[in-house]
Protein backbone atom coordinates (compact mmCIF):
# COMPACT_ATOMS: atom_id res chain seq x y z
CA UNK A 1 0.00 0.00 0.00
CA UNK A 2 0.98 3.60 -0.89
CA UNK A 3 2.53 5.74 2.25
CA UNK A 4 -0.26 7.93 3.29
CA UNK A 5 0.34 11.43 2.99
CA UNK A 6 1.09 13.58 5.71
CA UNK A 7 -0.28 17.62 5.86
CA UNK A 8 1.74 19.86 7.32
CA UNK A 9 1.70 20.35 10.52
CA UNK A 10 2.94 16.77 11.31
CA UNK A 11 6.06 14.71 13.05
CA UNK A 12 9.05 13.79 10.89
CA UNK A 13 9.67 10.22 11.10
CA UNK A 14 12.94 10.06 13.19
CA UNK A 15 16.00 10.61 10.89
CA UNK A 16 13.84 11.92 8.20
CA UNK A 17 14.22 15.67 6.92
CA UNK A 18 10.38 17.38 6.06
CA UNK A 19 9.79 17.73 2.34
CA UNK A 20 10.27 20.63 0.15
CA UNK A 21 8.75 23.64 0.74
CA UNK A 22 8.45 22.80 4.43
CA UNK A 23 10.70 23.78 7.34
CA UNK A 24 11.26 22.29 10.67
CA UNK A 25 10.17 24.30 13.68
CA UNK A 26 12.25 23.41 16.27
CA UNK A 27 9.45 24.72 18.92
CA UNK A 28 6.66 22.60 17.52
CA UNK A 29 9.02 19.88 16.90
CA UNK A 30 6.60 19.50 13.39
CA UNK A 31 7.51 19.62 9.89
CA UNK A 32 5.14 23.09 8.90
CA UNK A 33 4.68 25.20 5.52
CA UNK A 34 7.31 27.64 3.88
CA UNK A 35 5.66 30.98 2.81
CA UNK A 36 5.90 31.08 -1.02
CA UNK A 37 7.64 34.28 -2.17
CA UNK A 38 5.93 37.71 -1.61
CA UNK A 39 5.05 36.60 1.73
CA UNK A 40 6.18 36.19 5.18
CA UNK A 41 5.35 33.94 8.29
CA UNK A 42 2.68 36.46 10.18
CA UNK A 43 2.11 33.14 12.86
CA UNK A 44 4.41 30.45 12.77
CA UNK A 45 2.87 26.82 13.14
CA UNK A 46 1.62 24.75 16.66
CA UNK A 47 1.19 21.02 17.10
CA UNK A 48 -2.48 21.84 15.78
CA UNK A 49 -1.92 24.45 13.29
CA UNK A 50 -0.18 25.28 10.48
CA UNK A 51 1.78 27.88 9.44
CA UNK A 52 -0.23 31.26 8.49
CA UNK A 53 1.41 33.49 6.18
CA UNK A 54 0.86 37.22 4.77
CA UNK A 55 1.51 39.27 2.26
CA UNK A 56 4.64 41.41 2.11
CA UNK A 57 4.32 44.57 3.10
CA UNK A 58 4.74 47.98 1.35
CA UNK A 59 8.63 48.28 -0.03
CA UNK A 60 8.82 44.90 1.33
CA UNK A 61 9.70 41.82 -0.59
CA UNK A 62 10.57 38.06 0.09
CA UNK A 63 12.24 36.01 -2.94
CA UNK A 64 12.21 32.63 -2.07
CA UNK A 65 10.14 30.15 0.33
CA UNK A 66 10.47 31.28 4.03
CA UNK A 67 9.35 32.06 7.21
CA UNK A 68 10.54 34.92 8.32
CA UNK A 69 8.60 36.94 10.66
CA UNK A 70 8.88 39.99 8.65
CA UNK A 71 9.98 40.50 4.89
CA UNK A 72 12.98 42.48 3.86
CA UNK A 73 13.00 46.37 3.13
CA UNK A 74 13.30 46.85 -0.64
CA UNK A 75 16.31 49.18 -1.31
CA UNK A 76 16.30 52.87 -1.46
CA UNK A 77 15.20 55.08 -4.40
CA UNK A 78 17.52 54.71 -7.40
CA UNK A 79 19.66 57.96 -6.89
CA UNK A 80 20.06 60.75 -10.19
CA UNK A 81 22.79 58.76 -11.65
CA UNK A 82 21.44 55.59 -11.72
CA UNK A 83 18.64 53.82 -13.41
CA UNK A 84 16.14 51.41 -11.71
CA UNK A 85 16.20 48.17 -14.25
CA UNK A 86 13.91 46.26 -11.86
CA UNK A 87 10.99 47.69 -9.84
CA UNK A 88 10.87 46.36 -5.86
CA UNK A 89 7.90 44.48 -6.34
CA UNK A 90 6.95 42.06 -3.18
CA UNK A 91 8.95 39.03 -4.60
CA UNK A 92 11.72 40.83 -5.57
CA UNK A 93 14.40 43.82 -4.49
CA UNK A 94 14.81 47.24 -6.38
CA UNK A 95 17.77 47.14 -8.26
CA UNK A 96 19.64 50.26 -9.55
CA UNK A 97 22.21 50.35 -12.41
CA UNK A 98 24.59 52.88 -13.23
CA UNK A 99 23.37 55.44 -15.78
CA UNK A 100 25.41 55.99 -19.20
CA UNK A 101 28.69 57.66 -18.57
CA UNK A 102 29.03 56.12 -15.12
CA UNK A 103 30.76 52.67 -13.66
CA UNK A 104 30.50 51.25 -10.22
CA UNK A 105 32.92 52.67 -8.45
CA UNK A 106 31.38 50.83 -4.90
CA UNK A 107 30.00 47.42 -5.70
CA UNK A 108 27.70 45.41 -3.11
CA UNK A 109 26.11 42.15 -2.62
CA UNK A 110 24.11 42.44 -6.28
CA UNK A 111 25.20 45.58 -8.13
CA UNK A 112 26.42 48.73 -7.05
CA UNK A 113 26.17 51.28 -4.15
CA UNK A 114 27.75 54.10 -5.67
CA UNK A 115 27.92 55.56 -9.34
CA UNK A 116 30.59 57.38 -10.23
CA UNK A 117 30.96 59.51 -13.90
CA UNK A 118 33.93 57.86 -16.54
CA UNK A 119 36.98 59.42 -16.46
CA UNK A 120 37.23 62.09 -19.84
CA UNK A 121 40.76 62.08 -21.38
CA UNK A 122 42.01 65.79 -22.34
CA UNK A 123 43.18 66.45 -26.07
CA UNK A 124 46.28 64.79 -26.38
CA UNK A 125 45.34 62.04 -24.64
CA UNK A 126 43.14 58.76 -25.65
CA UNK A 127 41.61 56.29 -24.31
CA UNK A 128 43.81 53.18 -23.26
CA UNK A 129 41.54 50.99 -22.06
CA UNK A 130 37.69 51.45 -21.79
CA UNK A 131 35.23 51.93 -18.81
CA UNK A 132 33.47 49.20 -18.30
CA UNK A 133 29.97 48.53 -15.41
CA UNK A 134 33.14 48.30 -12.77
CA UNK A 135 36.10 50.20 -13.37
CA UNK A 136 36.83 53.79 -14.87
CA UNK A 137 38.91 55.05 -17.95
CA UNK A 138 42.50 54.72 -18.43
CA UNK A 139 43.66 57.65 -20.79
CA UNK A 140 47.36 57.55 -22.01
CA UNK A 141 49.36 60.00 -23.80
CA UNK A 142 49.09 60.04 -27.69
CA UNK A 143 52.11 58.33 -29.44
CA UNK A 144 54.15 60.15 -32.26
CA UNK A 145 52.20 60.15 -35.50
CA UNK A 146 48.70 60.06 -33.08
CA UNK A 147 46.49 62.98 -31.48
CA UNK A 148 43.14 63.08 -29.81
CA UNK A 149 41.82 66.92 -29.99
CA UNK A 150 38.80 66.19 -28.04
CA UNK A 151 37.48 65.21 -24.49
CA UNK A 152 36.55 62.11 -24.53
CA UNK A 153 35.71 59.04 -22.36
CA UNK A 154 35.46 57.01 -25.14
CA UNK A 155 37.37 58.23 -28.45
CA UNK A 156 41.41 56.60 -28.97
CA UNK A 157 44.20 58.15 -30.15
CA UNK A 158 44.01 58.48 -34.58
CA UNK A 159 46.59 58.97 -36.65
CA UNK A 160 47.78 62.15 -38.14
CA UNK A 161 46.43 62.48 -41.71
CA UNK A 162 49.42 62.18 -43.63
CA UNK A 163 50.07 65.06 -46.27
CA UNK A 164 52.09 65.87 -49.58
CA UNK A 165 53.22 69.14 -48.01
CA UNK A 166 52.48 69.66 -44.88
CA UNK A 167 51.24 73.11 -43.81
CA UNK A 168 51.43 72.90 -39.94
CA UNK A 169 52.23 69.35 -38.51
CA UNK A 170 50.37 67.70 -36.50
CA UNK A 171 50.87 67.59 -32.47
CA UNK A 172 49.48 65.25 -29.89
CA UNK A 173 46.47 67.55 -29.64
CA UNK A 174 46.01 68.22 -32.71
CA UNK A 175 45.79 66.57 -36.16
CA UNK A 176 48.23 68.00 -39.37
CA UNK A 177 47.38 70.48 -41.20
CA UNK A 178 47.92 69.89 -44.91
CA UNK A 179 48.57 72.46 -48.28
CA UNK A 180 45.88 73.13 -50.71
CA UNK A 181 47.26 69.96 -52.46
CA UNK A 182 44.88 66.72 -51.38
CA UNK A 183 47.09 64.64 -48.86
CA UNK A 184 47.90 61.19 -49.81
CA UNK A 185 46.03 59.73 -47.30
CA UNK A 186 43.68 60.90 -44.73
CA UNK A 187 42.13 58.92 -41.82
CA UNK A 188 38.36 58.90 -41.63
CA UNK A 189 36.96 62.37 -40.24
CA UNK A 190 35.39 61.21 -37.45
CA UNK A 191 36.31 60.21 -34.08
CA UNK A 192 36.64 56.70 -33.17
CA UNK A 193 34.17 55.77 -30.05
CA UNK A 194 34.53 53.13 -28.19
CA UNK A 195 31.20 51.25 -26.79
CA UNK A 196 29.53 52.60 -23.73
CA UNK A 197 29.59 50.12 -20.86
CA UNK A 198 26.33 47.69 -19.83
CA UNK A 199 25.75 48.57 -16.38
CA UNK A 200 24.96 45.29 -14.21
CA UNK A 201 21.76 45.16 -12.29
CA UNK A 202 22.05 45.63 -8.13
CA UNK A 203 19.85 44.97 -5.36
CA UNK A 204 19.99 45.88 -1.29
CA UNK A 205 19.34 42.97 0.89
CA UNK A 206 18.47 44.73 4.55
CA UNK A 207 15.36 44.21 6.72
CA UNK A 208 14.44 47.24 8.12
CA UNK A 209 12.55 47.42 11.50
CA UNK A 210 8.91 46.42 11.34
CA UNK A 211 8.23 47.43 7.97
CA UNK A 212 4.90 48.97 7.26
CA UNK A 213 4.28 49.69 3.64
CA UNK A 214 7.09 51.57 1.61
CA UNK A 215 7.97 53.45 -1.52
CA UNK A 216 11.97 53.81 -2.11
CA UNK A 217 14.62 56.43 -2.52
CA UNK A 218 18.26 56.05 -2.13
CA UNK A 219 21.27 56.10 0.31
CA UNK A 220 23.50 56.63 -2.99
CA UNK A 221 24.92 60.27 -3.61
CA UNK A 222 26.46 60.90 -7.33
CA UNK A 223 29.76 61.20 -6.51
CA UNK A 224 31.72 64.38 -8.29
CA UNK A 225 34.27 63.82 -11.21
CA UNK A 226 37.22 61.63 -10.00
CA UNK A 227 40.25 63.89 -9.47
CA UNK A 228 42.04 64.61 -13.03
CA UNK A 229 45.06 61.46 -14.03
CA UNK A 230 47.11 62.78 -15.93
CA UNK A 231 46.20 63.40 -19.25
CA UNK A 232 42.26 63.31 -17.60
CA UNK A 233 39.75 66.04 -16.75
CA UNK A 234 36.73 65.38 -14.71
CA UNK A 235 34.78 67.93 -16.63
CA UNK B 1 -0.81 61.37 -17.28
CA UNK B 2 -1.46 60.29 -13.64
CA UNK B 3 -5.22 61.73 -12.19
CA UNK B 4 -6.78 60.83 -9.55
CA UNK B 5 -10.49 62.68 -9.93
CA UNK B 6 -12.89 62.59 -7.13
CA UNK B 7 -16.68 63.09 -7.22
CA UNK B 8 -17.87 66.67 -5.55
CA UNK B 9 -18.87 68.00 -2.74
CA UNK B 10 -21.85 66.16 -0.32
CA UNK B 11 -24.33 68.20 2.19
CA UNK B 12 -25.61 65.32 4.66
CA UNK B 13 -27.42 65.29 7.80
CA UNK B 14 -26.04 63.73 11.25
CA UNK B 15 -26.28 59.84 10.95
CA UNK B 16 -26.56 59.42 7.42
CA UNK B 17 -23.51 57.71 5.03
CA UNK B 18 -21.61 58.73 1.96
CA UNK B 19 -19.48 57.31 -0.08
CA UNK B 20 -16.97 59.28 -2.23
CA UNK B 21 -15.28 58.36 -5.14
CA UNK B 22 -11.84 58.19 -6.67
CA UNK B 23 -11.69 57.69 -10.33
CA UNK B 24 -7.75 57.14 -11.29
CA UNK B 25 -6.60 57.04 -14.63
CA UNK B 26 -2.82 57.00 -16.47
CA UNK B 27 -1.29 54.54 -14.67
CA UNK B 28 -1.51 50.85 -13.76
CA UNK B 29 -3.55 50.17 -10.79
CA UNK B 30 -1.59 46.88 -9.83
CA UNK B 31 1.01 47.63 -7.71
CA UNK B 32 -0.17 51.19 -5.79
CA UNK B 33 -1.92 51.73 -3.16
CA UNK B 34 -5.20 53.73 -2.63
CA UNK B 35 -4.93 55.85 0.61
CA UNK B 36 -7.82 58.40 2.26
CA UNK B 37 -6.96 61.08 4.21
CA UNK B 38 -9.13 63.86 5.66
CA UNK B 39 -9.07 67.14 6.87
CA UNK B 40 -11.05 69.32 8.90
CA UNK B 41 -11.55 73.15 8.41
CA UNK B 42 -8.68 74.35 9.79
CA UNK B 43 -6.93 71.66 10.85
CA UNK B 44 -4.09 69.25 9.21
CA UNK B 45 -4.32 66.36 7.53
CA UNK B 46 -5.22 62.80 9.33
CA UNK B 47 -4.37 59.06 7.65
CA UNK B 48 -8.01 57.35 7.34
CA UNK B 49 -6.69 54.24 5.67
CA UNK B 50 -5.38 52.17 2.63
CA UNK B 51 -6.78 50.01 0.12
CA UNK B 52 -4.42 47.31 -1.99
CA UNK B 53 -6.85 47.86 -5.31
CA UNK B 54 -5.02 44.24 -6.63
CA UNK B 55 -6.11 42.41 -3.54
CA UNK B 56 -9.00 44.78 -2.02
CA UNK B 57 -6.81 44.38 1.49
CA UNK B 58 -7.37 47.31 3.77
CA UNK B 59 -5.47 48.83 6.74
CA UNK B 60 -7.76 51.91 8.95
CA UNK B 61 -6.22 53.98 11.55
CA UNK B 62 -7.80 51.81 14.52
CA UNK B 63 -10.02 55.69 15.14
CA UNK B 64 -11.64 54.99 11.50
CA UNK B 65 -12.07 51.01 11.50
CA UNK B 66 -15.86 51.41 12.32
CA UNK B 67 -16.57 54.32 10.75
CA UNK B 68 -15.32 53.91 7.04
CA UNK B 69 -15.18 51.46 4.41
CA UNK B 70 -13.10 51.32 1.63
CA UNK B 71 -13.75 49.79 -1.29
CA UNK B 72 -12.35 49.89 -4.82
CA UNK B 73 -13.50 48.27 -8.33
CA UNK B 74 -10.70 47.73 -10.46
CA UNK B 75 -12.87 47.40 -13.91
CA UNK B 76 -13.46 51.06 -13.63
CA UNK B 77 -10.39 52.26 -11.83
CA UNK B 78 -12.08 53.61 -9.09
CA UNK B 79 -11.65 53.80 -5.07
CA UNK B 80 -14.54 54.45 -2.70
CA UNK B 81 -14.41 55.88 0.88
CA UNK B 82 -18.10 55.36 2.50
CA UNK B 83 -18.04 57.26 5.99
CA UNK B 84 -21.18 55.68 8.02
CA UNK B 85 -23.56 57.56 11.60
CA UNK B 86 -22.01 60.71 9.74
CA UNK B 87 -21.78 63.93 12.72
CA UNK B 88 -20.80 67.73 12.69
CA UNK B 89 -16.91 66.30 13.59
CA UNK B 90 -17.00 64.33 10.26
CA UNK B 91 -17.15 67.80 8.45
CA UNK B 92 -13.76 67.84 6.26
CA UNK B 93 -12.33 67.50 2.80
CA UNK B 94 -11.73 63.88 2.31
CA UNK B 95 -8.82 63.09 -0.05
CA UNK B 96 -7.63 60.08 -1.91
CA UNK B 97 -3.90 59.56 -2.63
CA UNK B 98 -1.96 57.11 -3.99
CA UNK B 99 1.79 55.45 -3.15
CA UNK B 100 3.26 53.20 -5.50
CA UNK B 101 4.77 49.62 -4.13
CA UNK B 102 8.12 50.31 -3.58
CA UNK B 103 7.99 54.04 -2.67
CA UNK B 104 8.00 53.60 1.13
CA UNK B 105 4.12 55.26 0.79
CA UNK B 106 5.55 58.67 -0.92
CA UNK B 107 1.91 59.85 -1.97
CA UNK B 108 2.79 61.16 -5.20
CA UNK B 109 -1.07 62.04 -6.62
CA UNK B 110 -3.61 63.12 -4.85
CA UNK B 111 -6.85 64.01 -5.76
CA UNK B 112 -8.47 67.46 -5.82
CA UNK B 113 -10.99 66.59 -2.65
CA UNK B 114 -13.79 66.37 -1.58
CA UNK B 115 -15.79 68.59 0.52
CA UNK B 116 -18.18 66.74 2.70
CA UNK B 117 -20.37 68.72 5.39
CA UNK B 118 -22.24 67.36 7.64
CA UNK B 119 -25.52 69.66 9.37
CA UNK B 120 -29.05 69.29 10.35
CA UNK C 1 0.99 54.94 17.34
CA UNK C 2 4.04 56.99 16.31
CA UNK C 3 3.38 60.86 17.26
CA UNK C 4 5.23 63.46 14.43
CA UNK C 5 5.61 66.91 16.22
CA UNK C 6 6.61 69.83 14.09
CA UNK C 7 7.90 73.12 14.86
CA UNK C 8 7.79 75.37 14.87
CA UNK C 9 3.63 75.73 14.34
CA UNK C 10 4.10 78.71 12.60
CA UNK C 11 6.75 81.23 11.56
CA UNK C 12 6.94 84.67 9.70
CA UNK C 13 10.00 85.21 7.44
CA UNK C 14 10.97 87.73 4.38
CA UNK C 15 11.59 86.51 1.33
CA UNK C 16 15.56 85.44 0.33
CA UNK C 17 15.44 83.91 4.52
CA UNK C 18 16.70 80.35 5.14
CA UNK C 19 13.95 78.79 6.85
CA UNK C 20 14.44 74.69 9.02
CA UNK C 21 11.09 73.40 9.88
CA UNK C 22 11.75 70.26 12.44
CA UNK C 23 9.50 67.17 12.67
CA UNK C 24 10.24 64.92 15.91
CA UNK C 25 8.87 61.54 15.92
CA UNK C 26 7.60 60.11 19.14
CA UNK C 27 9.83 56.73 18.49
CA UNK C 28 12.41 55.76 15.64
CA UNK C 29 11.32 56.08 12.05
CA UNK C 30 13.44 54.59 9.02
CA UNK C 31 14.47 57.41 6.93
CA UNK C 32 13.13 55.96 3.82
CA UNK C 33 9.60 56.05 5.26
CA UNK C 34 9.48 59.87 6.16
CA UNK C 35 7.79 62.04 3.80
CA UNK C 36 7.26 66.06 3.64
CA UNK C 37 4.16 67.75 1.60
CA UNK C 38 3.31 71.28 0.83
CA UNK C 39 -0.19 72.89 0.88
CA UNK C 40 -1.47 75.80 -0.50
CA UNK C 41 -5.36 76.75 0.96
CA UNK C 42 -7.79 75.24 -1.03
CA UNK C 43 -5.50 73.22 -2.66
CA UNK C 44 -4.48 69.31 -2.58
CA UNK C 45 -0.94 68.38 -1.03
CA UNK C 46 1.58 68.17 -2.94
CA UNK C 47 4.49 65.51 -2.54
CA UNK C 48 7.52 67.84 -1.64
CA UNK C 49 10.41 65.61 -0.18
CA UNK C 50 10.51 61.91 -0.03
CA UNK C 51 12.66 59.17 1.88
CA UNK C 52 13.77 62.25 4.17
CA UNK C 53 15.93 63.70 1.32
CA UNK C 54 14.69 63.31 -1.87
CA UNK C 55 13.31 65.99 -3.93
CA UNK C 56 10.44 65.09 -6.59
CA UNK C 57 10.41 66.41 -10.33
CA UNK C 58 9.77 70.29 -10.12
CA UNK C 59 10.47 70.75 -6.36
CA UNK C 60 13.12 73.57 -6.29
CA UNK C 61 16.48 72.76 -5.41
CA UNK C 62 16.41 75.19 -2.61
CA UNK C 63 14.52 72.74 -0.74
CA UNK C 64 16.44 69.99 1.58
CA UNK C 65 15.44 67.20 4.04
CA UNK C 66 18.06 65.53 6.11
CA UNK C 67 17.75 63.60 9.36
CA UNK C 68 17.60 60.06 10.98
CA UNK C 69 16.25 58.51 13.65
CA UNK C 70 13.73 60.61 15.31
CA UNK C 71 14.86 64.14 14.02
CA UNK C 72 13.97 65.21 10.54
CA UNK C 73 14.06 68.59 9.23
CA UNK C 74 12.50 70.34 5.86
CA UNK C 75 15.01 73.42 5.18
CA UNK C 76 14.50 76.37 2.29
CA UNK C 77 17.85 77.81 2.03
CA UNK C 78 16.05 81.22 0.18
CA UNK C 79 12.64 81.94 0.58
CA UNK C 80 10.69 82.80 -2.39
CA UNK C 81 6.97 84.10 -2.49
CA UNK C 82 5.83 81.08 -3.96
CA UNK C 83 6.97 78.54 -0.97
CA UNK C 84 4.54 80.42 1.22
CA UNK C 85 2.40 77.57 2.33
CA UNK C 86 2.10 74.22 4.87
CA UNK C 87 4.41 71.78 5.14
CA UNK C 88 3.43 68.42 6.77
CA UNK C 89 5.79 65.62 7.83
CA UNK C 90 4.55 62.07 7.48
CA UNK C 91 5.66 58.90 8.89
CA UNK C 92 5.18 56.07 6.71
CA UNK C 93 6.92 53.43 8.98
CA UNK C 94 4.64 51.44 11.11
CA UNK C 95 0.87 51.73 11.08
CA UNK C 96 -1.36 53.82 11.39
CA UNK C 97 0.73 56.24 9.31
CA UNK C 98 0.45 59.95 11.15
CA UNK C 99 1.29 63.30 9.92
CA UNK C 100 2.98 66.42 12.17
CA UNK C 101 0.18 69.18 12.95
CA UNK C 102 1.34 70.91 10.05
CA UNK C 103 3.69 74.13 9.85
CA UNK C 104 2.51 77.46 8.44
CA UNK C 105 5.20 79.65 6.47
CA UNK C 106 4.04 83.10 6.42
CA UNK C 107 5.31 86.11 4.75
CA UNK C 108 6.69 88.98 7.03
Known amino acids: LPAQVAFTPYAPEPGSTCRLREYYDQTAQMCCSKCSPGQHAKVFCTKTSDTVCDSCEDSTYTQLWNWVPECLSCGSRCSSDQVETQACTREQNRICTCRPGWYCALSKQEGCRLCAPLRKCRPGFGVARPGTETSDVVCKPCAPGTFSNTTSSTDICRPHQICNVVAIPGNASMDAVCTSTSPTRSMAPGAVHLPQPVSTRSQHTQPTPEPSTAPSTSFLLPMGPSPPAEGSTGD | QVQLVQSGSELKKPGASVKVSCKAS????????MHWVRQAPGQGLEWMGRIDPATGNTKHDPKFQDKAVLSSDTSVSTAYLQISSLKAEDTAVYYC?????????????WGQGTLVTVSS | DIQMTQSPSSLSASVGDRVTITCTAS???????LHWYQQKPGKAPKLWIYSTSNLPSGVPSRFSGSGSGTDFTLTISSLQPEDFATYYC?????????FGQGTKVEIK
Open chain 3, 27 to 33: SSVSSNY
Open chain 2, 26 to 33: GFNNKDIY
Open chain 3, 90 to 98: HQYHRSPWT
Open chain 2, 97 to 109: ARSPYGDFGAMDY
